[in-house]
């Protein structure tokens, strides 16, 4: 048993261009707090439950208000350490996630609103009982400086907190075969009670006769390194310290959600829906009361006066989840068809339809010609959600209201001359041609290619095109 301790030194803009805007302002004062999540091993993809080593939430930092015009400085931090107690042996290799949260202060119902500012993650080797290790991590334009260490809680000692120490029974020396417990020279190592042959480096025990293995070791005496050679098609990187990665269908493989949370895949990762009393990325933060402000986005917290009684978040319109942490994105399902736009009015969804479409989801193609008049003898043609008029000769435009020049398209063939006429156009054909558009050549013998010329018209006469 022992405690992992994290000391945040600073959180502020990192070096280089593109300094981030201050998360707080005169109009929006806020304060920071931090959350740390630890899990054993070096593999982020490993299927063990998240935050298996534990998680901790810091106190809230001092209220900060940005000075207008000043660059975002290092932001004021909460006092004290973040402490994550661990019950079993310290694994020696671990992964961490440190999140910086912003708490917006205001008088909204249900307390302040929280939003995640930055998240850093890493994998480290660390022996318990060693000195503070310093670290710098960057998340976007932000930089987080911190130190961490793992220390054993008495009577445990050693790099994995697996050796036990007891006060000396004699004032001068320890019993036969037992060493003094450095650095507590006035204590002696307790007699080993593990299974005979259990590796002193890679195994430990909490009960007499047992042999439990540290990360990366296996076998009855913890003497066999975990092998990767027998792994078949691992999904991600693996190493001798982490063992095989079990292939799976996706990010919810092995259910990364703790405490009975249910996992659902998202385009980039996964999302946990947490049961009441738990929240966090993987539902690993628990023992929450209303005093902790667990309801996000202005949710109203009811009940939960102590960690044993559940609280309930009453969410404002547009939010859901046991902690009101999820925005209700009903429009993201694209319910509106035919280019209609989706409006989420809180109490209801509405599709605003484009012209020519109707229905709750804009699914009905309207009779485009209903109530639409085409002027000057034009006829309405339906289609495509917008009516179209087929205009009579001499007229054009959307509704046939514009007078068209019937000769604009040069309809008379073979050099015939076009004349606009009240009922259309007239082609005066060049010698040797006839027809409404001068399209027929006249044969040299005087007979035309037509069966007969219409009565009263001689070849070469102007033909009126109706």
């Amino acid at each position: 048993a022992g405690v992992f301790e994290l000391q945040i030194h600073s959180f502020g803009p990192g070096p280089g261009p593109g300094a981030p805007r201050s998360p707080c302002s005169a109009r929006l004062p806020c304060r920071l707090f931090f959350r740390v999540c630890l899990k054993p091993g070096l593999s982020e993809e490993a299927a063990e439950s998240p935050c298996a080593l534990g998680a901790a939430l810091s106190a809230r930092g001092p209220v900060y208000t940005e000075q207008p015009g000043a660059p975002a400085p290092d932001l004021p931090l909460p006092d004290g350490l973040l402490q994550v107690p661990f019950r079993d042996a310290w694994p020696g290799t671990f992964s961490f996630i440190i999140e910086t949260w912003r708490e917006e202060l205001g008088d909204q119902i249900g307390g302040p609103a929280w939003s995640l500012l930055a998240r850093v993650a890493g994998r480290r080797r660390l022996a318990a009982g060693g000195p503070w290790a310093r670290d710098i991590q960057r998340a976007g334009a932000w930089e987080l400086r911190f130190s961490y260490r793992a220390r054993c809680e008495p009577p445990a000692v050693g790099t994995a907190c697996t050796r036990l120490c007891r006060p000396r029974s004699a004032p001068s020396r320890c019993g036969p075969g037992l060493r003094p417990c450095a650095p507590l020279e006035d204590e002696c190592e307790a007699p080993l009670v593990c299974r005979a042959g259990c590796s002193p480096e890679h195994g430990f025990c909490e009960q007499p006769g047992e042999c439990r293995c540290l990360e990366g070791w296996t076998g009855p005496l913890c003497t066999v390194p975990v092998s990767t050679s027998s792994c078949l098609s691992p999904r991600g990187p693996s190493s001798a310290t982490t063992g095989c990665l079990v292939p799976g269908p996706g990010p919810c493989d092995g259910n990364p959600c703790a405490n009975g949370g249910s996992c659902s895949e998202t385009p980039r990762s996964f999302e946990c829906t947490c049961p009441r009393g738990f929240y966090g990325l993987r539902c690993e933060v628990s023992g929450v009361t209303c005093a902790d402000g667990p309801c996000f986005n202005g949710g109203l917290c009811v009940g939960g006066a102590d960690p044993d009684s559940a609280y309930i978040c009453h969410c404002p319109p547009g939010f859901q989840g046991s902690n009101c942490e999820k925005r209700v994105d009903r429009c993201s399902l694209q319910p509106c068809r035919n280019g209609g736009l989706c409006l989420d009015l809180g109490h209801a969804l509405r599709c605003r339809c484009r012209a020519g479409f109707a229905g709750p989801r804009c699914e009905h193609d309207l009779d485009d010609c209903a109530g639409r008049a085409c002027a000057n003898g034009g006829t309405c043609v339906e289609g495509g959600g917008a009516h179209r008029c087929s205009c009579a000769l001499g007229f054009g435009g959307r509704d046939c209201r514009e007078r068209a020049d019937p000769c604009a398209a040069r309809p008379c063939a073979h050099g015939g001359r076009c004349y606009a006429h009240f009922s259309g156009l007239v082609c005066a054909c060049a010698p040797g041609y006839m027809g409404a558009r001068c399209e027929f050549p006249v044969h040299p013998d005087g007979a035309s290619a037509l069966p007969a010329a219409p009565p009263g018209l001689r070849p070469g006469d102007p033909q009126r095109y109706l």
Epitope: D329, R330, Q334, L341, C342, L345, G346, A355
Partner: antibody, heavy 124, light 110 residues
Framework: QVQLQQSGPGLVKPSQTLSLTCAIS??????????WNWIRQSPSRGLEWLGR?????????DYAVSVKSRITINPDTSKNQFSLQLNSVTPEDTAVYHC??????????????WGQGTMVTVSS | QSVLTQPPSASGTPGQRVTISCSGS????????VSWYQQFPGTAPKLLIY???QRPSGVPDRFSGSKSGTSASLAISGLQSEDEADYYC???????????FGTGTKVTVL
């Protein structure tokens, strides 16, 4: 972080075509949950919405009645931008032109991200 | 020209509550959600309220919106000196088939 960067000339002669471009970073012009708009602002007319383009399985556009006969808004997916063309301009078209995103899911009418604005003067 | 009508100016002392009205018709405010924008000189407008009363993240809860019938209003409680700006309402207009904006209200902090 979504940003809109406008570009285009600040001076256009009467009867010519005003052309502006809005480059998008942090979002996609062909996203099926946003709407891309052009809006202008002048002392005489105040804020005036000109038109929009958006993608919902195919491209759609809508234009304000006041400019419908001479406006075109086109998306350019290869450059992740959209453009405004306003033909036959007159001094009345002198204004600050803004591109803006309607990007809140369920609130396409709310312009949550704006370009920096381009002052366009129509003068010979 | 602007279809939605706002008072040209409004003022208050620090800490006071100021309300700006926006009057429209059945084809805009009466049937569609209202947005509010804040604009400082020389900058683009900033979204303050959408869907009548929703605040985007980062907007203080001193700003609140409401709608009734064909009118909408923006309230600023606990007025601060940095609230001195122009404020515009906006909505979609079904008959014009386009967005319409308000005439704008200049808020002065005395």
């Amino acid at each position: 972080q979504v940003q809109l960067q406008q570009s285009g000339p600040g001076l256009v002669k009467p009867s010519q075509t005003l052309s502006l471009t809005c480059a998008i970073s942090g979002d996609s012009v062909s996203s099926n949950s946003v709407v891309w708009n052009w809006i202008r602002q002048s002392p005489s007319r105040g804020l005036e919405w000109l038109g929009r383009t958006y993608y919902r399985s195919k491209w759609y556009d809508d234009y304000a009645v006041s400019v419908k006969s001479r406006i075109t808004i086109n998306p350019d997916t290869s450059k992740n931008q959209f453009s405004l063309q306003l033909n036959s301009v007159t001094p009345e078209d002198t204004a600050v032109y803004h591109c803006a995103r309607g990007g809140i899911v369920g609130a396409p009418d709310a312009f949550d991200i704006w370009g920096q604005g381009t002052m366009v003067t129509v003068s010979s | 020209q602007s279809v939605l009508t706002q008072p040209p100016s409004a003022s208050g002392t620090p800490g006071q509550r100021v309300t700006i009205s926006c009057s429209g018709s059945s084809s805009n405010i009466g049937s569609d959600p209202v947005s509010w924008y804040q604009q400082f000189p020389g900058t683009a407008p900033k979204l303050l309220i959408y869907t009548n009363n929703q605040r985007p993240s980062g907007v203080p809860d001193r700003f609140s919106g409401s709608k009734s019938g064909t009118s909408a209003s923006l309230a600023i409680s606990g007025l601060q000196s940095e609230d001195e700006a122009d404020y515009y309402c906006a909505a979609w207009d079904d008959s014009l088939n386009g967005h319409v904006f308000g005439t704008g209200t200049k808020v002065t902090v005395l």
